[in-house]
Interface confidence: low
């Protein structure tokens, strides 16, 4: 349905509050270094313009596309060249090239200071003094640090952020009420950002066919009672929503997401029995709830897949008639029967099935050729099962911190060229899989673990793409989306790597170490561990453990000393020397 004025259409559909929030998110995700006040000014100007178009859709410039309007507005920023360098060249281009140019300059690792949380009383005062500005600041700060954050979902986070302050700033113990809520929002927000980043990478690097395959598998697991046609309709709509959000079309994305939620709630009977409690909620909460809804129960007495996909003499005929549809149906049927498999495993099985049909349907006796196709699935299924089993055993044996350290060593040996901060961030997050998934029942472990690892490894791929240093990382990241995790798992010690020269400065610590939080101390120690492995990639587990134990003892000793700085100055060089000896 075409509208005379796209901006008026979206303003009316979304309402002023959501419109302003989404425009602020869009601008903050594009111009990540701009000050808050500058963005607020731009958003207010766009909003006033939108209102004139609502009043008269024929008014001047109201017929322009959103990309044109928003791009023109971004290009009015005076300091564009000084702040963003070559991004300013985007403004010389015409749409749609200009928007593509802005998208290409989104920075997944912007050079922004970490967000510092002020005292609770300071935050509550700011909240009460100007609630609207306080919430806009939240949207701005999150969006500029996470340029692919799923915008309509960020509005939901902002609503929860507001609710937390509204409740806790009136509580007797403000901090006890507020801080756990803020911690939860921070952790959920980081997870949500990373999950969305994988969706955008999937669409941008591997195309919408890859995303649709992922969505067919996931939605078939969630909605096993829905018919294939219904799942396909949801997949088509969901692909449109995420394509729009990943492409910076945040107003269209939020509008279409609301339409999808409406459709799902109006058609619950043909989708899932689990949607009921979501559908009674207000819009933002409803959409979030639908996205996170648990898997419905599998229909009783589902027939064996073999009849239609192996035993039937029509397999090649059906495949040739509409390849993607036939493979989509296979994926749907397999996924609805296997909520215990990761989505990535299901996609690997579909890929293996496709490869078999490509080969066998050209053979003299196709049926004979593909008769054993399901047997070929066995090793594909067993590989992630064994991996999860082994790593959960290791996690239970070591605990989270030491499990992270084991992964740090493992991944530094695989790809030592990768920067130390990236290796620390990624390995720490890989290590969180233990606490997240290993406590779950057997049937939920693999989907939890492998699909979480896919999200974390995508972060490695995204950061590595910005500054490529390892051919092995590039290969694992670009060859196949579904085989990324097995590709990284299969990497061995990089024999070609020339060990890094020992730098005593890297292992020099000061008294400020003692005032760090437990998490910050861990990061310092893990940074040192990565540097040790880069210096001695062939160091044994025992050697590394010895050095890390010495390190912990040295830090503990100096943090208990009266003159901490003097202790670090004296004991530090001894620790460095002892470490060199231990690794010789």
């Amino acid at each position: 349905d075409t509208h005379k004025s796209e901006v008026a259409h979206r303003f009316k559909d979304l309402g002023e509050e959501h419109f302003k929030g989404l425009v602020l998110v869009a601008f903050s995700q594009y111009l990540q270094q701009c000050p808050f006040e500058e963005h607020v000014k731009l958003v207010n100007e766009v909003t006033e313009f939108a209102k004139t178009c609502v009043a008269d859709e024929s008014a001047e410039n109201c017929d322009k596309s959103l990309h044109t309007l928003f791009g023109d507005k971004l290009c009015t920023v005076a300091t564009l060249r000084e702040t963003y360098g070559e991004m300013a060249d985007c403004c010389a281009k015409q749409e749609p090239e200009r928007n593509e140019c802005f998208l290409q300059h989104k920075d997944d690792n912007p050079n922004l200071p970490p967000l510092v949380r002020p005292e609770v009383d300071v935050m509550c005062t700011a909240f009460h003094d100007n609630e609207a500005t306080f919430l806009k600041k939240y949207l701005y700060e999150v969006a500029r640090r996470h340029p692919y954050f799923y915008a309509p979902e960020l509005l939901f986070f902002a609503a929860r952020y507001k609710a937390a302050f509204a409740e806790c700033c009136q509580a007797a113990d403000k901090a006890a009420c507020l801080l756990p809520k803020l911690d939860e929002l921070r952790d959920e927000g980081k997870a949500s950002s990373a999950k969305q980043r994988l969706k955008c990478a999937s669409l941008q690097k591997f195309g919408d066919r890859a995303f649709k395959a992922w969505a067919v598998a996931r939605l078939s697991q969630k909605f096993p009672k829905a018919e294939f046609a219904e799942v396909s309709k949801l997949v088509t709509d969901l692909t449109k929503v995420h394509t729009e959000c990943c492409h910076g079309d945040l107003l269209e994305c939020a509008d279409d997401r609301a339409d999808l939620a409406k459709y799902m709630c109006e058609n619950q009977d043909s989708i899932s029995s689990k949607l009921k409690e979501c559908c009674d909620k207000p819009l933002l909460e409803k959409s979030h709830c639908l996205a996170e809804v648990e898997n419905d129960e599998m229909p009783a007495d589902l027939p064996s897949l073999a009849a239609d996909y192996v035993e039937s003499k029509d397999v090649c005929k059906n495949y040739a008639e509409a390849k993607d549809v036939f493979l989509g149906m296979f994926l749907y049927e397999y996924a609805r029967r296997h909520p215990d498999y990761s989505v990535m495993l299901l996609l690997r099985l579909a890929k293996a099935y496709e490869a078999t049909l490509e080969k066998c349907c050209a053979a003299a006796d196709p049926h004979e050729c593909y008769a054993k196709v399901f047997d070929e699935f066995q090793p594909l299924v067993e590989e992630p099962q064994n991996l999860v089993k082994q790593n959960c055993e290791l996690f239970e044996q070591l605990g989270e911190y030491k499990f992270q350290n084991a992964l740090l060593v493992r991944y530094t040996k695989k790809v030592p060229q990768v920067s130390t901060p990236t290796l620390v961030e990624v390995s720490r997050n890989l290590g969180k899989v233990g606490a997240k998934c290993c406590k779950l029942p057997e049937a939920k472990r693999m989907p939890c673990a492998e699909d979480y690892l896919s999200v974390v490894l995508n972060r490695l791929c995204v950061l590595h793409e910005k500054t490529p240093v390892s051919e092995k990382v590039t290969k694992c990241c670009t060859e196949s989306l579904v085989n990324r995790r097995p590709c990284f798992s299969a990497l061995e010690l990089d024999e070609a790597y020339v060990p890094k020269a020992f730098n005593a400065e890297t292992f020099t610590f000061h008294a400020d170490m003692c005032t760090l939080s437990e998490k910050e101390k861990q990061v310092k120690k893990q940074t040192a561990l990565v540097e040790l492995v880069k210096h001695k990639p062939k160091a044994t587990k025992e050697q590394l453990k010895g050095v890390m134990d010495n390190f912990a003892a040295f830090v503990e000793k100096c943090c208990k000393a009266d003159d901490k700085e003097a202790c670090f100055a004296e004991e530090g060089p001894k620790f460095v020397a002892a470490s060199q000896a231990a690794l010789a």
Epitope: A229, K233, T236, Y263, A322
Partner: nanobody
Framework: EVQLVESGGGLVQPGRSLRLSCAAS????????MHWVRQAPGKGLEWVSG????????TYADSVKGRFTISRDNAKNSLYLQMNSLRAEDTALYYC????????????????WGRGTLVTVSS
């Protein structure tokens, strides 16, 4: 280039039958759901019937249920509408329309239209 060419229209008496055909070209026919949509003189468009890519999901407007039958032959890239027990109110220009999807689910998306074939039911 997508082309949809309708045929089979004409003047017919009430109670009689007519079969409309639509020849499709310029795209992979079996990758799309198809529809018949009609427009009576001086009236708006009225959706008549739709059929999914493989023919296993078919839907009809209440006004034609039990009288009209939609079908397709993917080998011949053709869509058909068998119209029985025709009434004066079936008089309209009948369009063959390609959906954007394979399926008939929710609201269809009418992506490509033919030029139409005129059916006149009169005694």
């Amino acid at each position: 280039e997508v082309q949809l060419v309708e045929s089979g229209g004409g003047l017919v008496q009430p109670g009689r039958s007519l079969r409309l055909s639509c020849a499709a070209s310029g795209f992979t026919f079996h990758h799309y759901a198809m529809h018949w949509v009609r427009q009576a003189p001086g009236k708006g468009l009225e959706w008549v019937s739709g059929i999914s890519w493989n023919g296993n999901k078919i839907t009809y407007a209440d006004s034609v249920k039990g009288r009209f039958t939609i079908s397709r032959d993917n080998a011949k890239n053709s869509l058909y509408l068998q119209m029985n027990s025709l009434r004066a109110e079936d008089t309209a220009l009948y369009y063959c329309v390609r959906d954007s999807s394979l399926f008939i689910v929710g609201a269809p998306t009418f992506e490509h239209w033919g030029r139409g074939t005129l059916v006149t039911v009169s005694s």
